[in-house]
Interface confidence: low
C-alpha cells in the first residue's frame, strides 16, 4: 500500500521538515524559518509557537516539531501544551480572583497551585489524629483510640529485649 | 557582505575521518537552513546533507553518505560542520557549504535551492 501511495502521490516522499507545494509542481521546499512540519507528505508548514510574555521557552521550534512553552518563575502551566500560565501562590494558599488567600480552618494546600483540600477525617477510619493539620499540611491519622487503650492487643509482637549491657550483633 | 569560508579539508586514507568547518559572516546565521554539496572532477555538483535553520533533525542525507557523514551547526559560533568518517576513494570532492534561501520552488538537495555558496575545500581519499 505504501508503494503504491508514494507511485500515484509524491508529495508522499516530502519527509518532516518540508512541505509539497501543488503550486510548483509537488516539489518538496524545505519549511520556512519559524514553521515546521512534523509529518511527511504534508501540503504546508505550520507556524511556531512563540513563548511570549509569560511564557518561556521549554523546547525550541525544530522544522520538525513546535516550539514547547513551560512559564516564567511564579507561575505554572495549566491546560494542554501548557495553554495558559497561573500564578503561584504559597503552601498554605489558594488562587482566588482576589489573588492568592490563606486557606480556611480545616483545609489545606501543600503545594503552590491548586485548591486548598479538607482535612482528612481520621474518624471515618475509625482513627485518631495522631498529627493535628495546618494550612499547609494535612492531619496524620494514628491507631485507632481503641488500639491505644489498657489491654489491647498488638498487631506487632514486641521486641525481644536484650540483656543490660550487650550491644546489638 | 554575505561570506562563507570552508576550512578542515585535506588528504586521508580510506577508512578515515575529517571534520569539516564552514564559517558565516555577514549576515543572521540561525535564520536560514544549510547545506554541505561536493563537486568531484568532472562530475556535477552533488548533494550531501542539509540542516534546517535552528539545528533541527537532518531531513535531508544523501544514500551515498548515510551513516558516515554527519551535519550540524552552532549558531552561538556562526559555523555550520560535515564530520566525515569511513571515508572512501568515491569521497573525494571539493565540499561546499551553502545558504538556503528564505523560500525556494526547487527541490531542497538541488543546488538552486541555495544562494550564497562558500569557495569550497578539497577532499582527497587515497
Known amino acids: 500500500f505504501e508503494r503504491t501511495r508514494s507511485l500515484q502521490d509524491p508529495c508522499s516522499n516530502c519527509p518532516a521538515g518540508t512541505f509539497c507545494d501543488n503550486n510548483r509542481n509537488q516539489i518538496c521546499s524545505p519549511c520556512p524559518p519559524n514553521s515546521f512540519s512534523s509529518a511527511g507528505g504534508q501540503r504546508t508548514c505550520d507556524i511556531c509557537r512563540q513563548c511570549k510574555g509569560v511564557f518561556r521557552t521549554r523546547k525550541e521550534c525544530s522544522s520538525t516539531s513546535n516550539a514547547e512553552c513551560d512559564c516564567t518563575p511564579g507561575f505554572h502551566c495549566l491546560g494542554a501544551g501548557c495553554s495558559m500560565c497561573e500564578q503561584d501562590c504559597k503552601q498554605g494558599q489558594e488562587l482566588t480572583k482576589k489573588g492568592c488567600k490563606d486557606c480556611c480552618f480545616g483545609t489545606f494546600n501543600d503545594q503552590k497551585r491548586g485548591i486548598c483540600r479538607p482535612w482528612t477525617n481520621c474518624s471515618l477510619d475509625g482513627k485518631s489524629v495522631l498529627v493535628n493539620g495546618t494550612k499547609e499540611r494535612d492531619v496524620v491519622c494514628g491507631p485507632s483510640p481503641a488500639d491505644l487503650s489498657p489491654g489491647a492487643s498488638s498487631v506487632t509482637p514486641p521486641a525481644p529485649a536484650r540483656e543490660p549491657g550487650h550491644s546489638p550483633q | 557582505e554575505v561570506q562563507l569560508l570552508e576550512s578542515g579539508g585535506g588528504e586521508v586514507q580510506p577508512g578515515g575521518s575529517l571534520r569539516l568547518s564552514c564559517a558565516a559572516s555577514?549576515?543572521?546565521?540561525?535564520?536560514?537552513?544549510m547545506a554541505w554539496f561536493r563537486q568531484a572532477p568532472g562530475k556535477e555538483r552533488e548533494f550531501v546533507s542539509r540542516l534546517a535553520w535552528n539545528g533541527g533533525s537532518t531531513d535531508y542525507v544523501a544514500e551515498s553518505v548515510k551513516g558516515r557523514f554527519t551535519i550540524s551547526r552552532d549558531n552561538a559560533k556562526n559555523t555550520l560542520y560535515l564530520q566525515m568518517s569511513s571515508l572512501r576513494a568515491e569521497d573525494t570532492a571539493v565540499y561546499y557549504c551553502?545558504?538556503?534561501?528564505?523560500?525556494?520552488?526547487?527541490?531542497?538537495?538541488?543546488?538552486?535551492?541555495?544562494?550564497?555558496w562558500g569557495q569550497g575545500t578539497l577532499v582527497t581519499v587515497k
Open positions: 551553502a545558504r538556503q534561501r528564505s523560500y525556494s520552488r526547487y527541490d531542497i538537495r538541488t543546488p538552486q535551492t541555495y544562494d550564497y
Open positions: 555577514g549576515w543572521a546565521f540561525g535564520n536560514y537552513g
